[in-house]
C-alpha cells in the first residue's frame, strides 16, 4: 500500500519507547518524526525493533536529512549504522576522528568493509587525519579497498600503510590512483636500500613515470621481466636502451621472449636499431 | 648536434656561493638526466650531481652534498649547478654532461671555478 | 663508494703499437663500465660503454673486455690523435666513480 495514510489520533509518540514496536508498519511510516529519531538514536539502538522497522527509521532519516545526516546524528548511530549503505555515507560529512572511531567499533566484525571504508574516505575528504586507530580498523579490510578510495582521497592515507599493500591488493586501481600510491610508496620506502627496497616498490611499479623508472634504474634493481611487463607503456617507450639496460641488469636476455608483445614491442619501435643492436640480442625496432 | 655550454665560472673567496648554468641544444634536454662532473687542476674526473629528467630526483656524492644543488629549467634547457660554502679543494673545471643510464655520452666544454683568498 | 684503479698511470707508445690499459673495481660492477679520452685543455669524450660497447664515431681500433672486478681498454694500432689521457668509470652504483687515469705518450 503506496498511498500515505495520516497518523491515527493519539499516535503520534513524543519518545521513542517500548510502545513503537505494536505499532503497524504504516503507523510508523505515518507518526513517527525524523527529528525524534535523530534525538533519541540511543534508545532506537537500544529497544529490539524488527529489521523491517529499522528500514522504516531509516526512511524516515533520511526524508528528514536528505543532503546527508548531520554529524550530531552520525556521532549517535550506533548499531544502527549497520542499515546505511555506503551511498548513504558518501553523503555525509565527517570531521571528527571520533565519529568515526565509534562507527569503526560498531562495524568491527560485521562485513562491513564497504562502510568503513565509505566512512573513511568522507573523513579524509573533509580534511581529516588518520589516527593510530583508525588506521588500525583499516588493518584488517583487504588493501584492495584503496582503489576504491578518490585519488584526493588517497593523499590523506599515511604512508605507513603501504608496508601493507601485497602483490595483487592494487589490481583494479586505476593509472591514476597507482601514480599516487607510487608516490607514497617512495615515501613509505626512503630509509630501505637495495633489494629489499625494490621488493616493496614492486607492487606500486605500475604507477611510476618514465621519470621515476629512470631514477629506479640507477639503484641496480635488476627488474624481473613480469614485473617490467606491467609498467605503464607511455612511461615504459621513452626510455633508452641503456636505461632499460640498467633496469634490468641480468634479465635483459628477457626481453627477446618478450619482444612481439606489449609492452616490450611498443618499447622496441621507439628505439634505434644500432642501439638495439648494441645489446647483441637480435632484437629488433 | 649535442651541444652543452657551461657558464658562470670564476673566482670566489671561500665559503663564498657560485651559480653555474649549462646551456643545452640538438636534444630533447626533457629527456634526459643530466650531471655536473669536476676535474681539478692536473686531477681526475669526479662526479658531483646528477638530476632526473623532470627534476624531480637529484644524487650528490658525500663530498658536496647540503652544499650544492642541482636543477634544472626543462623550459629553458638549461641546467644549474648551485655552489654554497665553497671550499679550496672545489677548485676545478666544472663539466656539464649528459646521463644515459649510467654513462655520460656527451660533455659541455667546462667552466673554470677557482676558490681562493 | 667503489674505488676504481687504473694501471699503469702512464706509458710511453709509439705509433702503431698496441697499447693496453686496465682498471679495476674495489666489488663487482657487473659489466657497467665505461671508458673515456680526454686530451690536455678538452673535455672527456665517451669511448666505450658497458665494457666492449663503442659510442658512435669512436674507430674501431678501440676496444673494451672484462667482467666483474677487471677491465681492460684495447688500442690495436696506436694513431697520432690517440695521445691522451684515459679514464675508467664506473656506472653500476652511485656514487658513480673514475678512475684516476692513464696518460698514453709518445714515445
Known amino acids: 500500500d503506496t498511498e500515505q495514510k495520516a497518523c491515527p489520533p493519539g499516535k503520534e509518540p513524543n519518545v521513542v519507547d517500548e510502545n513503537l514496536i505494536f505499532y503497524q508498519n504504516w503507523e510508523l511510516e505515518a507518526c513517527v518524526d525524523g527529528t525524534l529519531l535523530a534525538g533519541q538514536m540511543d534508545l532506537v539502538n537500544e529497544i529490539p525493533f524488527t529489521y523491517e522497522q529499522l528500514s522504516i527509521f531509516k526512511h524516515k532519516l533520511d526524508k528528514t536529512y536528505p543532503q546527508g545526516y548531520p554529524e550530531s546524528l552520525i556521532k549517535q548511530l550506533g548499531h544502527f549504522f549497520r542499515y546505511v549503505s555506503p551511498e548513504d555515507i558518501r553523503q555525509w560529512n565527517v570531521t571528527s576522528p571520533d565519529t568515526v572511531n565509534t562507527l569503526l567499533k560498531v562495524s568491527k566484525g560485521q562485513k562491513m568493509d564497504a562502510q568503513v571504508i565509505a566512512l573513511v574516505a568522507c573523513y579524509l575528504r573533509g580534511g581529516g587525519k588518520l589516527d593510530e586507530d583508525i588506521v588500525k580498523a583499516l588493518d584488517n579490510i583487504p588493501l584492495s579497498y584503496l582503489c576504491d578510495f578518490s585519488p584526493q582521497d588517497l593523499h590523506a592515507i599515511p604512508s605507513s600503510v603501504m608496508w601493507l599493500v601485497g602483490l595483487h591488493d592494487l589490481d583494479k586501481c586505476s593509472q591514476r590512483h597507482l601514480g599516487i600510491l607510487y608516490q607514497k610508496a617512495c615515501s613509505a620506502f626512503q630509509n630501505v636500500s637495495g633489494l629489499e627496497y625494490f621488493e616493496k616498490i614492486r607492487t606500486f611499479l605500475g604507477g611510476a613515470s618514465r621519470e621515476d623508472l629512470r631514477a629506479l634504474s640507477q639503484h641496480n634493481v635488476s627488474m624481473d621481466i613480469a614485473t617490467f611487463k606491467k609498467l605503464q607503456v607511455d612511461a615504459l617507450v621513452g626510455l633508452s636502451v641503456a636505461e632499460v639496460q640498467k633496469l634490468l641488469g641480468p634479465h635483459i636476455g628477457d626481453l627477446k621472449t618478450e619482444e612481439d608483445k606489449s609492452p616490450v614491442r611498443d618499447w622496441l619501435f621507439r628505439q634505434q636499431q644500432k642501439d638495439l643492436d648494441s645489446l647483441g640480442l637480435g632484437l629488433q625496432g | 648536434e649535442v651541444q652543452l655550454v657551461e657558464s658562470g665560472g670564476g673566482l670566489v673567496q671561500p665559503g663564498g656561493s657560485l651559480r653555474l648554468s649549462c646551456a643545452a641544444s640538438?636534444?630533447?634536454?626533457?629527456?634526459?638526466?643530466m650531471s655536473w662532473v669536476r676535474q681539478a687542476p692536473g686531477k681526475g674526473l669526479e662526479w658531483v650531481a646528477t638530476i632526473s629528467n623532470g627534476g624531480t630526483y637529484t644524487y650528490y656524492p658525500d663530498s658536496v652534498k647540503g652544499r650544492f644543488t642541482i636543477s634544472r629549467d626543462n623550459s629553458k634547457n638549461t641546467l644549474y649547478l648551485q655552489m654554497n660554502s665553497l671550499r679550496a679543494e672545489d677548485t676545478a673545471v666544472y663539466y656539464c654532461?649528459?646521463?644515459?643510464?649510467?654513462?655520460?655520452?656527451?660533455w659541455g666544454q667546462g667552466t673554470l671555478v677557482t676558490v681562493s683568498s | 663508494d667503489i674505488q676504481m684503479t687504473q694501471s699503469p698511470s702512464s706509458l710511453s707508445a709509439s705509433v702503431g703499437d698496441r697499447v693496453t690499459i686496465t682498471c679495476r673495481a674495489s666489488?663487482?660492477?657487473?659489466?657497467?663500465l665505461n671508458w673515456y679520452q680526454q686530451k690536455p685543455g678538452k673535455a672527456p669524450k665517451l669511448l666505450i660503454y658497458y665494457t666492449s660497447r663503442l659510442h658512435s664515431g669512436v674507430p674501431s681500433r678501440f676496444s673494451g673486455s672484462g667482467s666483474g672486478t677487471d677491465f681492460t681498454l684495447t688500442i690495436s694500432s696506436l694513431q697520432p690523435e690517440d695521445f691522451a689521457t684515459y679514464y675508467c668509470?664506473?656506472?653500476?652504483?652511485?656514487?658513480?666513480?673514475f678512475g684516476q687515469g692513464t696518460k698514453v705518450e709518445i714515445k
Open positions: 640538438g636534444f630533447t634536454f626533457s629527456d634526459y638526466f
Open positions: 668509470q664506473q656506472g653500476n652504483t652511485l656514487p658513480y666513480t
Open positions: 666489488q663487482d660492477i657487473s659489466n657497467y
Open positions: 654532461a649528459r646521463f644515459d643510464g649510467y654513462y655520460f655520452d656527451y
